[in-house]
């Protein structure tokens, strides 16, 4: 459909509340350092303008694209160059280059302090102005996560508001709020990581890579739906995510609503698990569909070999309709394997494709591809064995110990990577233990590999900004589906020149005593990385001794009457001790 005014069309489709929320998210994701009030002003101006266009679509500037209108708004900010430096250079470009330029300036690791929830203050803010409270949440999440899936953020903001509606009435606000906020925080961080991977796959590997990923995932989740149905949803979903990743948040939210409507209208042919979802309001409905439980497999599934090995038309299909045929294979294989990770399914499809590419050029293709399914077993065994070993290690060491083992492993593999990045990534990799190792056997593989894909994508995104390791670049860029096996296969870097010992790195202060447990761990793990960068060949025994001595030193000073004085005296002794152990 063509509309005289795109902004009027979106305003009418989305309604004022969602329109304002999405505009606020869009500005917050681009201008991540601007104060909230600045954004509110921009949102108000854009909303007023949209209303004039709704009243008269022929009014001045109403025919302009949303990119043009948003870009003009951003470029009109007087302090743009002062606060954002070369982002202001984008304003010299014309659309669509200007929008592309804005997207390239999104910062995945903005220097914004961590949010610390204060229940009393937050309840006061909530009771004073609910609308502002909702907007502030959107702003704070969007500026920290510039690729967050905008319509999904609107959903989380509703949940956030509900938590406060309930807990601010409670006698003990903190007891009610803190666990709920922490639970929501984990969900939001996972959602941010999932969307970042989707955007990376579209932007770095193309739409086809994203479609293959979605085809496998949806085929697992909706095994009763036929290929045509899944393909239609995949195509629509790719459009939605392309738009959101490209900053077209209004169009993205509008199209996502249309897709949810289509899925619910056709749920009989898609999945038996959508009934509850489809009775919910829009945002909850879309979220619920995205998180829907896997449907049961149809009882009458035929052996895959019939269609993809034994049939004499395999090469005809492969040659004449390559993408469709491989898509059918991926669909059929995925729906039969809800226990496999998406990456594993895509690796299997790649092997199948490579085999046909080779065999269909030969004299006797059926004889050549007859054993293709046997080639899949090693692909399945590799992650299964890796997960088994790592889960055993997790059971033995516990979460913190397992994280430390991963810090050692990854610092040795890629010591050039910055210390904060190594700590962040290894800590997140370590969480795979508590997330997945307790799960039933048939869920472990998909849980672990799909989660590791999210964490390794974070490493790739951070590394791309300041590339320091050829090995990381290679693993990140060669193949999306082989990233995890690529990192797993890396060996300690023997070419690395150890860092000089800097005493300041191992200087600690009294603030360490009052830090929450996780921040205390981060301090210790930072020291561990620095230690390894100085002594990459340190043995496990040496590292264990240093960590034990460190814990004793911190415990001693935090129990002393004057913390700071103790750190000043004991700190230098501890450094000498470290050097002695590692000598």
């Amino acid at each position: 459909d063509t509309y005289k005014s795109e902004i009027a069309h979106r305003f009418k489709d989305l309604g004022e509340q969602y329109f304002k929320g999405l505009v606020l998210i869009a500005f917050s994701q681009h201008l991540q350092q601007c104060p909230y009030e600045e954004h509110v002003k921009l949102v108000r101006e854009v909303t007023e303008f949209a209303k004039t266009c709704v009243a008269d679509e022929s009014a001045e500037n109403c025919d302009k694209s949303i990119h043009t209108l948003f870009g003009d708004k951003l470029c009109a900010i007087p302090s743009l160059r002062e606060h954002y430096g070369d982002l202001a250079d984008c304003c010299e470009k014309e659309e669509p280059e200007r929008n592309e330029c804005f997207l390239q300036h999104k910062n995945d690791n903005p220097d914004i302090p961590k949010l610390k929830p204060d229940p009393v203050a937050l309840c006061a803010d909530f009771q004073e102005d609910e609308q502002k409270f909702w907007g502030k949440y959107l702003y704070e999440i969007a500026r920290r996560h510039p690729y967050f899936y905008a319509p999904e953020l609107l959903y989380y903001a509703i949940i956030y508001k509900d938590v406060f509606s309930e807990c601010c009435q409670a006698a003990d606000k903190a007891a009610c709020l803190l666990p709920k906020i922490e639970h929501l925080r984990e969900k939001v961080l996972t959602s941010a990581a999932k969307q970042r991977l989707k955007c990376a796959s579209i932007q770095k590997f193309g739409e086809r890579a994203f479609k293959a990923w979605s085809l496998a995932r949806l085929s697992q989740r909706f095994p009763k739906a036929d290929f045509t149905e899944i393909s239609k949803i995949v195509t629509d979903l790719a459009k939605v995510h392309k738009e959101c990743c490209h900053g077209d948040l209004l169009e993205c939210a509008d199209d996502r609503a249309d897709l949810a409507k289509y899925i619910c209208e056709n749920q009989d042919t898609i999945s038996t698990k959508l009934k509850e979802c489809c009775d919910k309001p829009l945002l909850e409905k879309s979220h619920c569909i995205a998180e829907a439980k896997r449907d049961e497999l149809p009882a009458d599934l035929n052996p895959l070999e019939h269609d993809f090995v034994e049939d004499k038309e395999v090469c005809k299909n492969y040659k004449e309709a390559k993408h469709v045929f491989l898509g059918t294979f991926l669909y059929e294989y995925s729906r039969r394997h809800p226990d496999y990770s998406v990456s594993l399914l895509l690796r299997i499809a790649k092997i199948y494709e490579a085999t046909l590419e080779d065999c269909c050029a030969k004299e006797d293709p059926p004889a050549c591809y007859a054993t293709v399914f046997d080639k899949f077993q090693p692909l399945v065994d590799e992650p299964k064995n890796l997960i088994k070993q790592n889960c055993e290690l997790f059971e033995k060491l516990g979460e913190y110990g397992f994280q430390n083992a991963l810090i050692v492993r990854y610092t040795k593999k890629v010591p050039q990577v910055s210390t904060p990045t190594l700590v962040e990534v290894a800590r997140k990799l370590g969480l795979v233990g508590s997330r997945c190792c307790k799960r039933p056997e048939e869920e472990r593989l998909s849980c672990a590999e799909d989660y590791l894909s999210l964490v390794l994508n974070r490493l790739c995104v951070l590394h791309e900004k300041t590339p320091v390791s050829e090995k990381v670049t290679k693993c990140c860029t060669e193949s999306l589906v082989n990233r995890r096996p690529c990192f797993s296969a890396l060996t300690p870097d023997e070419t690395y020149k150890p860092k000089e010992f800097v005493e300041g790195t191992f200087t600690f202060h009294a603030d360490l005593c009052t830090l929450p447990e996780d921040e205390k761990q981060i301090k210790k793990q930072t020291a561990l990385v620095e230690l390894l960068k100085h002594k990459p060949h340190a043995t496990e025994e040496q590292l264990r001794t240093v960590l034990g001595n460190f814990a004793a030193f911190v415990q001693k000073c935090c129990a002393a009457p004057d913390h700071e004085a103790c750190f000043a005296v004991e700190g230098p002794k501890f450094v000498i001790e470290i050097r002695g152990i590692l000598a």
């Epitope: 036929d226 045509t228 393909s231 035929n302 019939h306 004499k312 038309e313 309709a321 469709v324």
Partner: nanobody, 126 residues
Framework: EVQLLESGGGLVQPGGSLRLSCAAS????????VAWFRQAPGKGREFVAG????????YYADSVKGRFTISRDNSKNTLYLQMNSLRPEDTAVYYC???????????????????WGQGTLVTVSS
């Protein structure tokens, strides 16, 4: 989910022609892999010709290549089989089968087609 109804069979002399039709309802025929099979007395169902769903790729058994042509008319939701240069060994009941949601004929195994018409008899005899 898919109902199929064949027509167009009959008695024809060797060397003659016939056009079979298969009208589909309950599903658009262009989204469904559809195929013609035949069954001679005392024999199993054998694949004759097929056409992909949404992808116009056609498939033929070696015994009918160059003589039979499969096609469909999406506006009429109907599948056709144009049979020329008919031979006595083409005598059989002709069935159309559908595998919904399949873009390609990835199998010629009759058991894999969940939907069938009731068949139309073709007799080639002088």
């Amino acid at each position: 989910e898919v109902q199929l109804l064949e027509s167009g069979g009959g008695l024809v002399q060797p060397g003659g022609s016939l056009r079979l039709s298969c009208a589909a309802s309950g599903r658009y025929i262009d989204e469904t892999a559809v195929a013609w099979f035949r069954q001679a007395p005392g024999k199993g169902r054998e694949f004759v010709a097929g056409i992909g769903g949404g992808v116009d790729i056609t498939y033929y058994a070696d015994s009918v290549k160059g003589r039979f042509t499969i096609s469909r008319d999406n506006s009429k939701n109907t599948l056709y089989l144009q049979m020329n240069s008919l031979r006595p060994e083409d005598t059989a009941v002709y069935y159309c089968g559908a595998r919904p949601g399949r873009p390609l004929i990835t199998s010629k195994v009759a058991d894999l087609y969940p939907y069938w018409g009731q068949g139309t008899l073709v007799t080639v005899s002088s």
